[in-house]
Amino acid sequence: KLLQVSTIAMQQQEKLIQQERALLNFTEWKRSCALQMKYCQAFMQNSLSSAHNSSPCPNNWIQNRESCYYVSEIWSIWHTSQENCLKEGSTLLQIESKEEMDFITGSLRKIKGSYDYWVGLSQDGHSGRWLWQDGSSPSPGLLPAERSQSANQVCGYVKSNSLLSSNCSTWKYFICEKYALRSSV
């Protein structure tokens, strides 16, 4: 009988040790979770504050409403210009309105003067249709003024306050456009 009692006592003690071990593990796990939680919260706060402090457009880009614009300092053909913009998470400029056209031409006057700048407009050589790269057609007031005589592919560019057309293989400056970062407050 005594042996039976002592065996039960030992089993109970073993159970207790296991439970203590489990509790210790749980406490350790909880502490680890709390630390991770603190780390996550700190990380999120840092991210939010850095996003809060950062400007809606990258350095050397100009903001207007929801858009950021980059005016290149190098010349390239139309295709390379678009590739350069795409590398920056942007595309060649797509002019949506007269207001945007006025902003662009006004900004260009201040920055560089009367040069040629590729925009994201290309003409289908077979149908003669002008398209922005998202596939939309330019509004009637924003069609290139002169139809190029070139038998080659034709693309659109801005000069002074006009939208014109030229062989896509000619070298020009270019303008990239992307969405401005929106403040979360």
């Epitope: 795409l86 290309s122 998202d134």
Partner: nanobody, 112 residues
Framework: QVQLVESGGGLVQPGGSLRLSCAAS????????MSWVRQAPGKGLEWVAS????????SYTDSVEGRFTISRDNAKNTLYLLMDNLKPDDTAVYYC?????RGQGTQVTVSS
């Protein structure tokens, strides 16, 4: 450099269907309008359909409107042309095109 490789052409009966594919490489496919053009025997190149960089604004020449569907998969750098209710007049070599650059084309023949 820009490379466009068309496939999926063949001989089909009037009223039949085909799906053409165009595998693109050498440029950022997702950044450009893409088109299908065709050249019938003894004729010049004719624009068939175009689609915007993100898959929006599909447009078609009148003769294929309602029968052909242009689409793209930017993750796969591939342009498609689904051609339903084919007619003998659709017989041509079909090319996919980006900014005046074309592949070698794929032959589509509609005949009974």
């Amino acid at each position: 450099q820009v490379q466009l490789v068309e496939s999926g052409g063949g001989l089909v009966q009037p009223g039949g269907s085909l799906r053409l594919s165009c595998a693109a490489s050498g440029f950022t496919f997702s950044g450009y309008v893409m088109s299908w053009v065709r050249q019938a025997p003894g004729k010049g190149l004719e624009w068939v359909a175009s689609i915007g960089s993100g898959g929006g604004y599909p447009s078609y020449t009148d003769s294929v409107e309602g029968r052909f569907t242009i689409s793209r998969d930017n993750a796969k750098n591939t342009l498609y042309l689904l051609m339903d209710n084919l007619k003998p007049d659709d017989t041509a070599v079909y090319y996919c095109e980006m900014l005046g650059r074309r592949g070698q084309g794929t032959q589509v023949t509609v005949s009974s």
